[in-house]
C-alpha cells in the first residue's frame, strides 16, 4: 500500500514570498506524485512547480493559490492511488489603491458647507488599519469637522469648507506590511473671493500674417482682475503694448486678439486672474506659427500587372500635423476601390497597365501645401521585334546576332552560349538594343546561342544556331625555320583547313621541282635521306575552289646533330684544389657550349676569378670549396638542336696521412690532385 510519510498542511503565507507544501510517500514499488488544486491537476510553472514530491511556490499569489491543494501518489503499474489530506494557504497581503471621492457623486457637486466623504482603496488580509493625511500632515480621529471610519476606510468632512482644501492621501498597515495610496485626491473648496477659472486659453497654431485669439475668463466675488503677459513678462494692455505686439487687443471679456501674426509673436502667453483673496491663477497658452517642411523625393516604381502594391507617402514635418492625400491625373483618390488611399498609403490592387503614370502625394496645413510626384511604371512582358536567326558567320570577322524586344520598362537582355551565361569580355559585347557582337569569330563559336529578354513582369527567350564559315588557313602554320639531320630520313608536315578540304602541295621557292628522293604525300614533305642539297627555301601551297590559295614559306637547314666527343665525369676534389670538368661536342653548325651548375646557368662574363670555361668547352674551378659540390651540366647547342650531359662534383677534406699508409697508397676514389 502507498503510505504518506509527510502530508501537506494548511499554513500562513505571505503574498509574493516563498512557500512549500510538503509531501513524502513510501510505496512497495515506484510511484509518481502529482498535485491537485480544487480537484484539477497542477501544471508546473516557474512560479509554482513540483520539487521532488513536494510543491514549491517561488512567489505565493493570493488569486492563483487560493483553494485546496492535495498530493496524489500513483503506482502506475498496479493503478493504486493514494491521496493526502487537503491543505490551503491563509495568504496575508496588502495592496495599494487610490483615494477616491465617495460622496458627493462628482467633484462638480462639491460646494462649501456640504458633506464630503473620501474612501481609501487600500485592501488586504488581514484587514489593515488606516491613517489619513492632508498635504502630508496626519489627520487624527475626532479632530473638528472630520471623522475616520476604519471599517469602511472612509474619511468624512462635515461640513466641508475652504480650510479643508488640500491633497488627501492615506496609508494602511497590517501584519503583512504597509502601503500608501497609489493616487491621491485634491479637494478644492472654493472661497468666493478666490479667483476661479471659467475659460482657460488654448494653444493655437496660425499661419503667418493671420490672426490669433486667446480666450480667458475668471470669476470671483467681487469680480477678479485679469492681466495678459507675453513670454518676457511684458504686460499686454490696450494702453501699453510691447513693441513687438503692436497689433494686440485685450477685450472686456478677457480675450486677447493678435492680428497679422509674425514669427516674433510666437511663444507663451500667460493669463493671470487675481481675486480679492487667495493666490493668483496663472494660465498658459502657446502661440505656434504654422510651418511645413519639404517632402522627400520618391524613387520611380516599377510594378507588375495583377499584383497588389503600396506606396507610402511620408508626410513632411509640420505644425499642425499636415493632412495627406493622393491624386492621379488631377483627381483625388478615393478611400476604397481598386486604386485607393489607405492612411498615408497609395494602394494599387490587381494592377492594370492603365494604372501607369504619375501619382502625386499632397500634404497641407495652415502653413501651405507640398506635393511630390511618383512615377509608376507597370511592367509588361517583352515582345519580339526581331528574334535571333540561325546564322553563318565568317571566321576571323565580327559576327552579330539580333535580339530586339520591346517592353515597359526597357527590357534587360542576357545571352547564353551552350547554356552558359555570356559575360562581356574582349570577344563578346551586348549592345543596348540586345544585339550580341562576337568580335573575332572562331571555329568553336559554331554552337547554340540563346537570348533572354526580361522585365519584372516576365521574360521571353529564343535561340539560334551559329555555323562558322572557316577561312582557308594552315593548321598549324608550318615553322618558318626547320632543321633536318644530315643523312637521315626527315618529314616536314603541312596541313590546312577551309570551307572545303583544301589541296596541299610543296614546291621549292625558286619554282624548281622536287628531286626524286623527295616526295610530297598529302602535304607531308618526305626526305628519304637528307643531303646537303636539300637545304633551301620551300613553299607549302593550300588551295580550294571557293577560297583560292594560301602559301607558307619554310627555310630548311641541313645539319649534323650534336654528339659529345668528351663528356664530364663524376669528379672528387680535395678542398682548396682545382677541379676540371671536361666537355667537347661536335655538330654542324658547330655547337656552342654552356655550363649549368647548382641549377643556374654559369654566365662566362660573370664567373669571377675562380671559374673559367675554355674554348674547347671544359670548365675549370680553382680553389674549390664544399659549396661548389653538386651536379654540373654541360649544354651543347646550335641553331638546330640542343643536347646536355651532367656529372657530379664532390669536394672533400684532404685526409691526414697515417704512419701505416705508405706514400703510394691510392685514394679510394678518382681524385684530381694539383
Amino acid at each position: 500500500a502507498i503510505v504518506f510519510i509527510k502530508q501537506p498542511s494548511s499554513q500562513d503565507a505571505l503574498q509574493g514570498r516563498r512557500a512549500l507544501l510538503r509531501c513524502e510517500v513510501e510505496a512497495p514499488g515506484p510511484v509518481h506524485v502529482y498535485w491537485l488544486l480544487d480537484g484539477a491537476p497542477v501544471q508546473d510553472t516557474e512560479r509554482r512547480f513540483a520539487q521532488g514530491s513536494s510543491l514549491s511556490f517561488a512567489a505565493v499569489d493570493r488569486l492563483q493559490d487560493s483553494g485546496t491543494f492535495q498530493c496524489v501518489a500513483r503506482d502506475d503499474v498496479t493503478g493504486e492511488e493514494a491521496r493526502s489530506a487537503n491543505a490551503s494557504f491563509n495568504i496575508k497581503w496588502i495592496e495599494a489603491g487610490p483615494v477616491v471621492l465617495k460622496h458627493p457623486a462628482s467633484e462638480a457637486e462639491i460646494q462649501p458647507q456640504t458633506q464630503v466623504t473620501l474612501r481609501c482603496h487600500i485592501d488586504g488580509h488581514p484587514r489593515p488599519t488606516y491613517q489619513w493625511f492632508r498635504d502630508g500632515t496626519p489627520l487624527s480621529d475626532g479632530q473638528s469637522n472630520h471623522t475616520v471610519s476604519s471599517k469602511e476606510r472612509n474619511l468624512t468632512l462635515r461640513p466641508a469648507g475652504p480650510e479643508h482644501s488640500g491633497l488627501y492621501s492615506c496609508c494602511a498597515h497590517s501584519a503583512f506590511g504597509q502601503a500608501c495610496s497609489s493616487q491621491n485626491f485634491t479637494l478644492s473648496i472654493a472661497d468666493e473671493s478666490f479667483a476661479r477659472v471659467v475659460l482657460a486659453p488654448q494653444d493655437v497654431v496660425v499661419a503667418r500674417y493671420e490672426e490669433a485669439m486667446f480666450h480667458c475668463q475668471f470669476s470671483a466675488q467681487p469680480p477678479p482682475s485679469l492681466q495678459w503677459l507675453f513670454e518676457d513678462e511684458t504686460p499686454i494692455t490696450n494702453r501699453s503694448r510691447p513693441p513687438h505686439l503692436r497689433r494686440a487687443t485685450v477685450f472686456a471679456n478677457g480675450s486677447l486678439l493678435l492680428t497679422q501674426v509674425r514669427p516674433r509673436n510666437a511663444g507663451i502667453y500667460r493669463c493671470i486672474g487675481q481675486g480679492q483673496r487667495g493666490p493668483p491663477i496663472i494660465l498658459e497658452a502657446t502661440l505656434h506659427l504654422a510651418e511645413i517642411e519639404d517632402m522627400p523625393l520618391f524613387e520611380p516604381r516599377v510594378f507588375t500587372a495583377g499584383s497588389e502594391e503600396r506606396v507610402t507617402c511620408l508626410p513632411p514635418k509640420g505644425l499642425p500635423e499636415p493632412s495627406v492625400w493622393w491624386e492621379h491625373a488631377g483627381v483625388r483618390l478615393p478611400t476604397h476601390g481598386r486604386v485607393y488611399q489607405k492612411g498615408h498609403e497609395l494602394v494599387l490592387a490587381n494592377i492594370a497597365e492603365s494604372d501607369a503614370g504619375v501619382y502625386t502625394c499632397h500634404a497641407a496645413n495652415l502653413a501651405g501645401q507640398r506635393r511630390q510626384d511618383v512615377n509608376i511604371t507597370v511592367a509588361t512582358v517583352p515582345s519580339w521585334l526581331k528574334k535571333p536567326q540561325d546564322s553563318q558567320l565568317e571566321e576571323g570577322k565580327p559576327g552579330y546576332l539580333d535580339c530586339l524586344t520591346q517592353a515597359t520598362p526597357k527590357p534587360t537582355v542576357v545571352w547564353y552560349r551552350n547554356q552558359m551565361l555570356i559575360s562581356e569580355d574582349s570577344r563578346f559585347e551586348v549592345f543596348k538594343n540586345g544585339t550580341l557582337r562576337i568580335n573575332s569569330v572562331e571555329v568553336y563559336d559554331g554552337t547554340w546561342y540563346r537570348c533572354m529578354s526580361s522585365t519584372p513582369a516576365g521574360s521571353i527567350e529564343a535561340q539560334a544556331r551559329v555555323q562558322v564559315l572557316e577561312k582557308l588557313k594552315f593548321t598549324p602554320p608550318p615553322q618558318p625555320q626547320q632543321c633536318m639531320e644530315f643523312d637521315k630520313e626527315a618529314t616536314v608536315p603541312c596541313s590546312a583547313t577551309g570551307r572545303e578540304k583544301p589541296t596541299i602541295k610543296w614546291e621549292r621557292a625558286d619554282g624548281s621541282s622536287l628531286p626524286e628522293w623527295v616526295t610530297d604525300n598529302a602535304g607531308t614533305l618526305h626526305f628519304a635521306r637528307v643531303t646537303r642539297d636539300d637545304a633551301g627555301n620551300y613553299t607549302c601551297i593550300a588551295s580550294n575552289g571557293p577560297q583560292g590559295q594560301i602559301r607558307a614559306h619554310v627555310q630548311l637547314t641541313v645539319a649534323v646533330f650534336i654528339t659529345f666527343k668528351v663528356e664530364p665525369e663524376r669528379t672528387t676534389v680535395y678542398q682548396g684544389h682545382t677541379a676540371l670538368l671536361q666537355c667537347e661536342a661536335q655538330g654542324d653548325p658547330k655547337p656552342l657550349i654552356q655550363w649549368k651548375g647548382k641549377d643556374r646557368i654559369l654566365d662566362p662574363t660573370k664567373l669571377g676569378p675562380r671559374m673559367h670555361i675554355f674554348q674547347n668547352g671544359s670548365l675549370v674551378i680553382h680553389d674549390v670549396a664544399p659549396e661548389d659540390s653538386g651536379r654540373y651540366t654541360c649544354i651543347a647547342g646550335n641553331s638546330c638542336n640542343i643536347k646536355h650531359t651532367e656529372a657530379p662534383l664532390y669536394v672533400v677534406d684532404k685526409p691526414v696521412p697515417e704512419e701505416s699508409e705508405g706514400p703510394g697508397s691510392p685514394p679510394p676514389y678518382k681524385m684530381i690532385q694539383t
Partner: antibody, heavy 112, light 110 residues
Framework: EVQLVESGGGLVQPGGSLRLSCTAS????????MNWVRQAPGKGLEWVGI???????YYASWAKGRFTISRDTSKNTVYLQMNSLRAEDTAVYFC??????WGQGTLVTVSS | EIVMTQSPSTLSASVGDRVIITCQSS????????LAWYQQKPGKAPKLLIY???NLASGVPSRFSGSGSGAEFTLTISSLQPDDFATYYC??????????FGQGTKLTVL
C-alpha cells in the same frame, strides 16, 4: 483472483449509443485508477480516458464530449458510455487497471 | 494534442540480433520518466514490459531494457528470441492525467 472483465460490446448503428462495463474482482475500485483503451482492427492501441481513485475523469482530446467514463463502487464496475458512434469507433475496447492488469477486451462494431 | 512517434514502424530481424526501437513524444512526459513499453501478440491484450522508462516488469526477461528521458526513449532487445516477434508500443503519461500510445512497431522474422 484479481481480474477485469469487459462486457456490453456488440453491433450498433452509426449515430447510436452503447455502454460498456468493466467489472473488477479481487480489489476495490475506490483505491485504483482505471483506463479505457481501444484498438481498431489491424491498428494500434489508442488511449480513451481514465477515472482516478476519487472518481475524477480525464479524456483523450478526440474522446471529449462523446465518451463518458463513470463508476459504481458498490458494484465494483467502471463504465464507458459512448454516444454518436461512427464507423471509425469500431474497435476492441479494453479496460485496464494501471499498466499491468488488462481485461480481455470487448468488440464494438459500428455499422449500418 | 500529444503525438508519440515510434520508429521504425516495421522491423525485420533474425534470432540473436540486437534490436532498438525509438519513441519520440511531442512534449516531455511527466517527471521526464513516465513512459512504459508493451508487447502485444495478435488477439491478445498488451503485456507490460517496462515501466517508468527503465524498470523491468515482473516476469520479463533481462534481454529487454529501456532508456531515455524527457521526450526521447528507446527499447532495446539485446539478443532476439523466437518468442519476441510481436508488436511493441510505447505509452507516455503527461501532466494533467493524460496518456498516449505510439503507433506501434511490428517486429517480424527476416
Amino acid at each position: 483472483e484479481v481480474q477485469l472483465v469487459e462486457s456490453g460490446g456488440g453491433l450498433v448503428q452509426p449515430g447510436g449509443s452503447l455502454r460498456l462495463s468493466c467489472t473488477a474482482s479481487g480489489f476495490s475500485l475506490s483505491n485504483y485508477v482505471m483506463n479505457w483503451v481501444r484498438q481498431a482492427p489491424g491498428k494500434g492501441l489508442e488511449w480513451v480516458g481514465i477515472i482516478d481513485s476519487s472518481g475524477s475523469t480525464y479524456y483523450a482530446s478526440w474522446a471529449k464530449g462523446r465518451f463518458t467514463i463513470s463508476r459504481d463502487t458498490s458494484k465494483n464496475t467502471v463504465y464507458l458510455q459512448m454516444n454518436s458512434l461512427r464507423a471509425e469507433d469500431t474497435a476492441v475496447y479494453f479496460c485496464a487497471r494501471g499498466l499491468y492488469l488488462w481485461g480481455q477486451g470487448t468488440l464494438v462494431t459500428v455499422s449500418s | 494534442e500529444i503525438v508519440m512517434t515510434q520508429s521504425p514502424s516495421t522491423l525485420s530481424a533474425s534470432v540473436g540480433d540486437r534490436v532498438i526501437i525509438t519513441c519520440q513524444s511531442s512534449q516531455s512526459v511527466y517527471h521526464n520518466n513516465l513512459l512504459a513499453w508493451y508487447q502485444q501478440k495478435p488477439g491478445k491484450a498488451p503485456k507490460l514490459l517496462i515501466y517508468y522508462t527503465s524498470n523491468l516488469a515482473s516476469g520479463v526477461p533481462s534481454r529487454f531494457s529501456g532508456s531515455g528521458s524527457g521526450a526521447e526513449f528507446t527499447l532495446t532487445i539485446s539478443s532476439l528470441q523466437p518468442d519476441d516477434f510481436a508488436t511493441y508500443y510505447c505509452q507516455g503519461g503527461y501532466n494533467g492525467n493524460i496518456y498516449a500510445f505510439g503507433q506501434g512497431t511490428k517486429l517480424t522474422v527476416l
